[in-house]
């Protein structure tokens, strides 16, 4: 990946838009297509006051853990979808796009140095375990994806890119 491509806000906005489209295509979280089993996903809620005061290295750990769990979740959803009879083509397309998007974001974050932080996280023993919740519909899964990108990931890259500029 070109160095620091993630620091171009248009790049992340493209993936956010894809995630929002996927959420919209699943027709709302109440009546949309259900997952045949619950999938564990990261809790995307953020205390933004506290987040802004975290060290960028600590933010990187949370982002990387969230991204890993999200990737697992969407791969799991893909497997469940493949096993279902007559999967909707549009849904399959958005799952594929999400998997591709997460792979790209993972590569872009590696360039930014986020993975280094996971290898040797600061005060690893004190790091709070990643909060999770369960998704039972494709809509909820895509909403978590969208909220994760718009929340923790965007905030982290903003700070990490600003730090890299100095």
């Amino acid at each position: 990946a070109p160095p620091r491509l993630i620091c171009d806000s248009r790049v992340l906005e493209r993936y956010i838009l894809e995630a929002k489209e996927a959420e919209n295509v699943t027709m709302g979280c109440a009546e949309g297509p259900r997952l045949s089993e619950n999938i564990t996903v990261p809790d995307t809620k953020v205390n933004f006051y506290a987040w802004k005061r975290m060290k960028v290295e600590e933010q990187a750990v949370e982002v990387w853990q969230g991204l890993s769990l999200l990737s697992e979740a969407i791969l799991q959803a893909q497997a469940l979808q493949a096993n279902s009879s007559q999967p909707p083509e549009s849904l399959q397309l958005h799952i594929d796009k999400a998997i591709s998007g997460l792979r790209s974001l993972t590569s872009l974050l590696r360039v930014l140095g986020a993975q280094k932080e996971l290898m040797s996280p600061p005060d690893a023993t004190q790091a709070a375990p990643l909060r999770t919740l369960t998704a039972d519909t494709f809509c909820k899964l895509f909403r978590v994806y969208s909220n994760f990108l718009r929340g923790k990931l965007k905030l982290y890259t903003g700070e990490a890119c600003r730090r890299g500029d100095r």
Epitope: K45, N47, F48, Y49, K52, R53, N147, K154, R162
Partner: antibody, heavy 116, light 109 residues
């Protein structure tokens, strides 16, 4: 104790600028972001923007972009909010608020009156 | 941009339970903060991270959040609870804080 003390009331003419100060004491000024929130008479709270006192970077509410400037002087633990091109609708009490796990410490407020 | 909607006023009888709502698109996916403001005073936080109480705030104050609505619940309402209450959250698209319009709580009796 931890407190934020703001500058006194101001009366300004439309089109002028106002600069409100907020002096922090009782804590490490650069360890907490500072937000500015305003409240027009009889109206609700309106968030204007924040500044990171350590680095000086800012983020403003869309409504105030281009008219508001937030700065700080770390040597005297003071944050500033300057609003330009004032209009009568800018008449309000302006608060600075420290960001802990939430807006945990507020200044006493500064009344800015815009009148011709 | 993201908007939070609150009822202009809520009335409750002394000793009864008051519920103040705050509506916003998928607000259940976000943390919500509630501030109490009495006339001529700066706001004071009563609930943070949706349902946590800072020290000094009575247990009578609680918060919940699901779907498109967050709720501040004040049980056994007292005369001293009369105030304006504001919900606050975050606009993910602009990285900015957002306040609701505020609700005036009146305690009757």
């Amino acid at each position: 104790q931890v407190q934020l003390v703001q500058s006194g009331a101001e009366v300004k003419k439309p089109g002028a600028s106002v600069k409100v100060s907020c002096k922090a004491s009782g804590y490490t000024f650069t360890s907490y972001y500072m937000s500015w929130v305003r409240q027009a008479p009889g109206q609700g709270l309106e968030w204007m923007g924040w500044i990171n006192p350590l680095k000086g970077n800012t983020n403003y509410a869309q409504k105030f972009q281009g008219r508001v400037t937030m700065t700080r002087d770390t040597s005297i633990s003071t944050a500033y909010m300057e609003l330009s091109r004032l209009r009568s609708e800018d008449t309000a009490v302006y608060y600075c608020a420290r960001e802990g796990m939430y807006f945990d410490i507020w200044g006493q407020g500064t009344l800015v009156t815009v009148s011709s | 941009s993201y908007e939070l909607t609150q009822p202009l006023s809520v009335s409750v009888a002394l000793g009864q339970t008051a519920r103040i709502t705050c509506s916003g698109d998928s607000i259940g996916d976000k943390y919500v903060y509630w501030y109490q403001q009495k006339p001529g005073q700066a706001p004071v936080l009563v609930i943070y991270d949706t349902n946590k109480r800072p020290s000094g705030i009575p247990e009578r104050f609680s918060g919940s959040n699901s779907g498109n609505t967050a709720t501040l619940t004040i049980s056994r309402a007292q005369a001293g609870d009369e105030a304006d209450y504001y919900c606050q959250s975050w606009d993910l698209d602009f990285n900015t804080y957002v306040f609701g319009g505020g609700t005036k709580l009146t305690v009757l009796g």
